[in-house]
Interface confidence: medium
């Protein structure tokens, strides 16, 4: 491979590590979605409340004269609880409120997989760089881009899990905005599918330049 | 199904006393807040009181206030309004309505999305 | 006597538009969600809009909702003869710490 084409593996696998570490951070964050209640009548306090993939966390918040409850980074007496995924005999209404189990369990079993493919890209980019085995890039980019995907589905399938919730007549909130982890993991879908096409494309073999030329002629990469 | 069934109306004198039900089937009962409007004759509708989830927070018309009670039994998913020192004017055909949902804060609303077939009190000497 | 103010009556004829008004105060409708209840001869009360312009299942996209500050409308679009009901606002009204409804409007269908 060239000094060219491995400067731009490398600053790709750079993306992609960054791509890594903000999937990592989303996934075992609970801040993709924050929610606020309304009341027509409330307690000197709201619930307002936060989630990712794995719990979710509700915080009493002192409430003013006006209808808005928040932000959530005030200071509150925090309670959290994990969504219970596995365990399907156990009731699933936490803090008085039923949860979008069927969402949360797609989208953590997708989070999954992700991670699945992350580690597998990550073991054909380890395996490519100690024995020069350049040709063990290309599946390492499919994998990443795999992975990119699934956190993309993980996305929406929050996004839907929070339009559901919002709508529902069967929790107090009613506002919402995407958090910090919901950030993250657009950003390392980004990163991961954009850096694993890349990748793709710096790890195949040189087209041929002349019509006379096969693939077989091309340079060889190491 | 969500359904409410109101019971307990009639013919009672004026400084008389009457104790409304509504019994509630189909949905969480004490996740909700509830409420009693009224509608006397030829008149539109009057709000009358509502009780949040827990039973613990209550609120009242200012025509009703001092004489009637609202309470709720959520292990018998019912709720109650207790009417004392009636008047002529609280002649109405009473409703039971399910309002919106209540956490320990305080509830969504209050506004009724189901409605039961209403009761009679007819208070006349 | 009401805090929310409808007119007390309105009319048209099948398929034409008809609005009905509620007015409030910043207390009551400026600071909170409206409603809309529809009231047929001889039945009980039923939700037609609830958070301002959110319709039930069940209730056709002919009927719509609007806010705008202290005062909001109910839209009737290609009226039926079936519409022909009681219609009130209603909204929680914090000063009173309690529900407030409209006077009501009695549609006609002409």
């Known amino acids: 491979m060239s000094q060219t084409k491995m400067l731009k593996v490398r600053v790709t696998l750079f993306c992609i590590l960054a791509g890594i570490v903000l999937a990592m951070t989303a996934v075992v964050t609970d801040h993709w979605a924050v929610l606020s209640p309304h009341m027509e009548h409330h307690n000197t306090t709201c619930e307002a409340a936060h989630f990712g993939l794995w719990r979710i966390c509700t915080k009493r918040i002192p409430m003013d004269d006006s209808k808005t409850c928040g932000p959530i980074t005030l200071p509150g007496e925090k309670n959290c609880s994990y969504f219970r995924h596995f365990n399907p005999g156990e009731s699933s209404e936490i803090f008085e409120f039923t949860t979008q189990k069927e969402y949360s369990i797609s989208a953590a079993a997708i989070a999954i997989f992700s991670l699945g493919f992350i580690i597998l890209g990550s073991l054909c980019v380890l395996l490519s760089l100690g024995k020069k085995r350049d040709y063990l890039l290309r599946p390492a980019s499919m994998f990443y881009a795999f992975a990119g995907l699934c956190i993309l589905v993980s996305v929406e399938v929050m996004r839907q899990s929070v339009k559901r919730m919002i709508d529902s007549e069967d929790t107090v909130w009613i506002e919402y905005y995407y958090s910090w982890s919901f950030a993250c993991a657009c950003a390392a879908f980004i990163l991961l599918f954009l850096g694993g096409l890349a990748l793709l494309l710096f790890s195949l073999p040189r087209m041929p330049r002349n019509p006379w030329e096969s693939c077989m002629d091309a340079e060889p990469e190491h | 199904e969500v359904q409410l069934l109101e019971s307990g109306g009639g013919l009672v004198q004026p400084g008389g006393s009457l104790r409304l039900s509504c019994a509630a089937s189909?949905?969480?009962?004490?996740?909700?807040?509830m409420s009693w409007v009224r509608q006397g004759p030829g008149k539109g509708l009057e709000w009358v009181s509502s009780?949040?989830?827990?039973?613990?927070?209550?609120f009242y018309a200012d025509s009703v206030k001092g004489r009637f009670t609202i309470s709720r039994d959520n292990s018998k998913n019912t709720l109650y309004l207790q009417m004392n020192s009636l008047r002529a004017e609280d002649t109405a055909v009473y409703y039971c309505?399910?309002?919106?949902?209540?956490?320990?804060?305080?509830?969504?609303?209050?506004?009724?999305?189901?409605w039961g077939q209403g009761t009679t009190v007819t208070v006349s000497s | 006597q009401s805090v929310l103010t409808q007119p007390p009556s309105a009319s048209g004829t099948p398929g034409q538009r008809v609005t009905i008004s509620c007015s409030g105060s910043?207390?009551?409708?400026?600071?909170?969600?409206i409603y809309w209840y529809q009231r047929l001869p001889g039945t009980t009360p039923k939700l037609l809009i609830y958070?301002?312009?959110q319709r039930p299942s069940g209730v056709p996209d002919r009927f719509s909702g609007s806010k705008s500050g202290t005062s909001a409308s109910l839209a009737i679009s290609g009226l039926r003869s079936e519409d022909e009901a009681d219609y009130y606002c209603?909204?929680?009204?914090?000063?009173?710490?309690?529900?407030?409804f409209g006077t009501g409007t009695k549609v006609t269908v002409l």
């Open positions: 209603a909204a929680w009204d914090d000063t009173l710490s309690g529900y407030v």
């Open positions: 009780i949040s989830g827990s039973g613990g927070t209550t």
């Open positions: 189909g949905f969480t009962f004490n996740n909700y807040g």
């Open positions: 910043s207390s009551n409708i400026g600071n909170n969600y």
């Open positions: 309505g399910k309002g919106g949902y209540c956490s320990s804060s305080g509830c969504r609303h209050y506004g009724m999305d189901v």
């Open positions: 958070r301002n312009n």
